[in-house]
């Protein structure tokens, strides 16, 4: 994942005595918040593994990279990062592993330079449709986000509110068409069973899409046609059985694409013939020589590239009168 990194320049820790020493005064504009480490040279603030329950109020105006990982934030309310003056420089925000389960509409408003956002490893039971767009207008102001990292944000089964988790995430991605400039989207490890068909068409700038380690069974209704800039598509560790002709043609038509398909339970029957033919010819699949059959049993562990049409048969469907019970 491409979470923000910082240079190793010296960090000033806010010493425990500082809070009481300045208790009667408002905080200085570029003072380091309690429980954080700050480097003005690196424009970086780290408030990591400190069990913070809210976003610090007195973040220095110079902050470009903000790490709020390993905390207990629970909720990001509207305007969680809104400050006077605004945090105009903040470009990379990492909130991973901070026990967030609720991100409200407008949580990231007033961050005009925010390009990278990492919300991974938070059990997001309640992600507002307007978390990233900030308003419920049909067309919102464009978000500056270029990278959105949402790996492992699926909440436990009992906290999913009897609604489609996929639908909730996609609604947030598409609201107000705010994320038209998004180039990297990571959605790995989210138990996705399907990809809603409209999602990719509305993210035309995508260069990198990571859907690995989900439970995707099929891409039949997913169109990649508009993603002319797509450079990498990660589909490893899903439940894909076969890629059909329409999908193969669309992938082949993308000029810069690299596709990763390892560790899927490929079903090597007559429906696999087109995919095998395509694999033998295409250059877009990385590590294609590692792809093996999972089913039927007689084909298990056979390498897809080594199959020929005679290997790919379907058992005849018997008329009902001949079927055994």
């Amino acid at each position: 994942s491409s979470s923000p990194t910082s240079s190793a320049s010296s960090f000033s820790s806010s010493a425990p005595f500082l809070a009481s020493a300045v208790s009667a005064q408002p905080p200085l504009p570029d003072q380091c918040p309690a429980l954080c480490e700050c480097s003005e040279a690196a424009r970086t603030v780290k408030c990591v593994n400190r069990n913070l329950t809210e976003v610090p109020t007195d973040l220095p105006a110079y902050v470009r990279n903000l790490f709020l990982t390993g905390n207990q934030l629970a909720v990001l309310p509207a305007g969680a990062f809104a400050r006077r003056p605004p945090l105009a420089e903040l470009a990379a925000l990492n909130l991973s592993g901070s026990r967030l389960d609720e991100v409200r509409a407008g949580a990231f408003e007033h961050l005009p330079s925010l390009r990278q956002l990492d919300l991974s490893h938070n059990p997001l039971a309640d992600l507002s449709p307007f978390a990233f767009s900030g308003s419920n207008a049909s067309v919102s102001a464009p978000s500056p986000l270029v990278e959105l990292i949402l790996n492992h944000i699926v909440p436990p089964e009992d906290e999913r509110q009897n609604r489609s988790f996929e639908g909730m995430v996609v609604a947030a991605l598409l609201a107000g068409r705010a994320l038209q400039g998004l180039r990297r989207l990571e959605l790995a490890s989210n138990h996705f069973l399907y990809l809603p068909r409209d999602v990719l068409a509305q993210l035309p700038s995508l260069r990198h899409l990571d859907l690995s380690n989900n439970s995707l069974v099929s891409l039949t209704y997913v169109s990649f046609r508009n993603l002319t800039h797509l450079e990498s598509l990660h589909l490893e560790d899903n439940a894909l059985k076969v890629l059909h002709n329409g999908t193969l043609a669309e992938l082949q038509g993308l000029p810069h694409i690299r596709v990763f398909l390892d560790n899927n339970p490929w079903v090597c029957d007559c429906h696999m013939a087109d995919m095998v033919t395509w694999l033998k010819e295409t250059e877009v699949v990385q590590g294609k020589d590692r792809l093996t059959c999972a089913y039927p049993e007689k084909m298990r562990n056979r390498v897809l590239l080594e199959l020929n049409s005679a290997d790919l048969d379907c058992d005849p469907i018997l008329p009902p009168s001949l079927q055994t019970s």
Epitope: A19, L52, P56, Q72, A78, E102
Partner: antibody, heavy 120, light 111 residues
Framework: EVQLVESGGGVVQPGRSLRLSCAAS????????MHWVRQAPGKGLEWVAY????????YYADAVKGRFTISRDNSKNTLYLQMNSLRAEDTAVYYC?????????????WGQGTTVTVSS | DIVMTQTPLSLSVTPGQPASISCRAS??????????MHWYQQKPGQPPQLLIK???NLESGVPDRFSGSGSGTDFTLKISRVEAEDVGVYYC?????????FGGGTKVEIK
Amino acid sequence: EVQLVESGGGVVQPGRSLRLSCAASGFTFSNFGMHWVRQAPGKGLEWVAYISSGSSTFYYADAVKGRFTISRDNSKNTLYLQMNSLRAEDTAVYYCARSPAYYRYGLDYWGQGTTVTVSS
Amino acid sequence: DIVMTQTPLSLSVTPGQPASISCRASQSVSSSTFSYMHWYQQKPGQPPQLLIKSSSNLESGVPDRFSGSGSGTDFTLKISRVEAEDVGVYYCQHSWEIPYTFGGGTKVEIK
């Protein structure tokens, strides 16, 4: 047993300052966010200020913003409210109250309060 | 700011009878997973005491004749059988956003 004991109240003239303290015991003070809430004579409750467990986050009601400062000293298990430029409308009983680390759960323990009277 | 409106202003109840207090927020204070609404009791000469947190969760040590319900903008505190010790003022409060605001209070008296 959780205990919160406020002190520092008194009678003060308008424009002057006062510092309230709240001594906490019976729980791990550094794990909890703390609030000040006030109640004018015969009136309802008004939230005043909040400070997070590690002092990284603090919020104020508009009525006191720029005049009051909330702080804490976790080594002394003590919460403070520095009140400057006091006005007649600041006259109230001031309570300190605790909230669990997740602020969603309400104010679960309150002190007995300390009375501030602003009068010329 | 979110305005909390409590009704009624006062309530005179016969011991053993039920009582109900309503609180309406000027905007929703619930997410799909959580309600940020709490109820307090303030007996004469004492500080407030938390009765119910997040709409319906009884605080430990609070008698189970108290219950809370509601979501969004409308919330209710119920006392199934009022007892003499229940006299006092009851307040609702939200923690949806800063500033937290309280309702104006409902005074409960015994007939």
